[in-house]
């Protein structure tokens, strides 16, 4: 029962996570104009992975797609790739995990096959979550670098001849959605992997006694209690794996400033 609950919960958490990764990838607010230096702007700029937008004083929002592939920064391309890989792996993982769910009966599928599929989907969710977290973190790092570069440029340059305020960008809502979604997918993947251990059938290695009609000697094959105790090396049905839950990617949450102009 606990295994079914863990597997089901892992599936639901991963589903929410992947939906969040898709939402974050599609969102336009990956970076939003920093209003600290210009809180009274009537023109608000924000950018996504696929297009940049401007909201004007009329309330009208104009978005323009990045219609070039070669002209875009390599980092942006890398973030796009990471997010897409995350979505693809997550989608495949969801597909596999549906068939792996203990509560769903498909023909005469053995528990060992379900365990393997649960593990496979779990690993896919973990990698998917890591891809999303990595993508969002790379973009966030890019923003921080550009933010301080543009801050430095603000106090140098024109010598104050023309009062042009350079637009600086800060973290947009999509980054937080991406981090949370990536984390949920990762957690869901770990739960699937944990559920896999409970799904794998307990193997009973009782070896048959071999009788030889020609002679009087009887050959016994010992070692039949290994699997039932859960110890010893067993490479037949049980997959030996490293849980894969790594905690070195600690997400640092930055204070966000919400300005409504």
């Amino acid at each position: 029962m606990a295994v079914t609950a863990c597997q089901g919960l892992g599936f639901v958490v991963s589903l929410i996570g992947i939906a969040g990764i898709i939402a974050a990838t599609c969102m336009d607010q990956w970076s939003t104009q920093d209003l600290y230096n210009n809180p009274v702007t009537a023109v608000f700029n924000y950018q996504g992975l696929w297009r940049s937008c401007v909201r004007e004083s009329s309330g009208f929002t104009e978005c323009r797609g990045y219609f070039t592939l070669l002209g875009l920064p390599a980092m942006l391309q890398a973030v796009r790739a990471l997010m897409i890989v995350g979505i693809v792996l997550g989608a495949i993982g969801l597909l596999v995990s549906i068939f792996a769910l203990k509560c769903i009966r498909i023909g005469s599928m053995e528990d060992s096959a379900k365990a393997n599929m649960t593990l496979t989907s779990g690993i896919m969710f973990i990698v998917s979550g890591l891809c999303a977290i990595a993508g969002v973190s790379v973009f966030a790092n890019m923003l921080v670098t550009n933010f301080w570069m543009s801050t430095a440029n603000m106090y140098t340059g024109m010598g104050g001849m023309v009062q042009t305020v350079q637009t600086r960008y800060t973290f947009g809502a999509a980054l937080f959605v991406g981090w949370v979604a990536g984390g949920l997918t990762l957690i869901g993947g770990v739960m699937m992997c944990i559920a896999c251990r409970g799904l794998a059938p307990e193997e009973t290695n009782y070896k048959a006694v071999s009788y030889h009609a020609s002679g009087h000697s009887v050959a016994y094959k010992p070692g039949g209690f290994k699997a039932s105790t859960g110890f010893g090396s067993n490479t037949k049905n049980k997959k030996i794996y490293d849980g894969g839950a790594r905690t070195e990617d600690e997400v640092q949450s930055y204070p966000s400033k919400h300005d409504y102009v």
């Epitope: 023109v43 700029n45 401007v54 004007e56 004083s57 009329s58 009208f60 637009t167």
Partner: antibody
Framework: QVQLVQSGAEVKKPGASVKMSCKAS????????IHWVKQAPGQGLEWIGY????????NYNLKFKDRATLTSDTSSSTAYMELSRLRSDDTAVYFC????????WGQGTLVTVSS | DIVMTQSPDSLAVSLGERATINCKSS????????????LIWYQQKPGQPPKLLIY???TRDSGVPDRFSGSGSGTDFTLTISSLQAEDVAVYYC?????????FGGGTKLEIK
Amino acid sequence: QVQLVQSGAEVKKPGASVKMSCKASGFTFTSYNIHWVKQAPGQGLEWIGYISPGNGGSNYNLKFKDRATLTSDTSSSTAYMELSRLRSDDTAVYFCATGRGFAYWGQGTLVTVSS
Amino acid sequence: DIVMTQSPDSLAVSLGERATINCKSSQSLFNSGNQKNYLIWYQQKPGQPPKLLIYRASTRDSGVPDRFSGSGSGTDFTLTISSLQAEDVAVYYCQNDYSYPLTFGGGTKLEIK
């Protein structure tokens, strides 16, 4: 076609309040901000502020912030401006405007403040 | 606040001649996000509300005759009427559409010489 129809002229005494309306039609009311502009007789244009009917957000010119209140009613696609503690220098035509670059304007509401 | 300064205050031009109105802002109206200048030009005739001519410094509104054109960037902008017609007699205003509070120029009264 886009239309902004404003309420009729008002005559008020100093210290009183006035509430004028701006009824919108021909576009999605919640998609655009409704701005209010003052024009005193023989004078130029002065921006008062805007109301965003979509989320109820607003922004005011500090000069009018303590006396002007901008509201909207999405069910009737109408924006309102209330001006309190009227003074003689509030005598002006008040316009509502919307669209990209203020493409659409109301006909104006003349407010006369006189004792 | 951004101060908008229009010049001249009044202008008399012969029919068919070119009319030029200038507008200077105290701060740049250039938005680096989309490389556009947020300046608007209006025409106002007596007893009427202002009419939009140009937005984003150089984009003509629909229905505006092509004799009206806007140019400039940053802090200096110009409205040009290439061939003045009798119906162009009006007061012309420029407006900062980049920063709150939105501010207007003092207006330029255009007359026929």
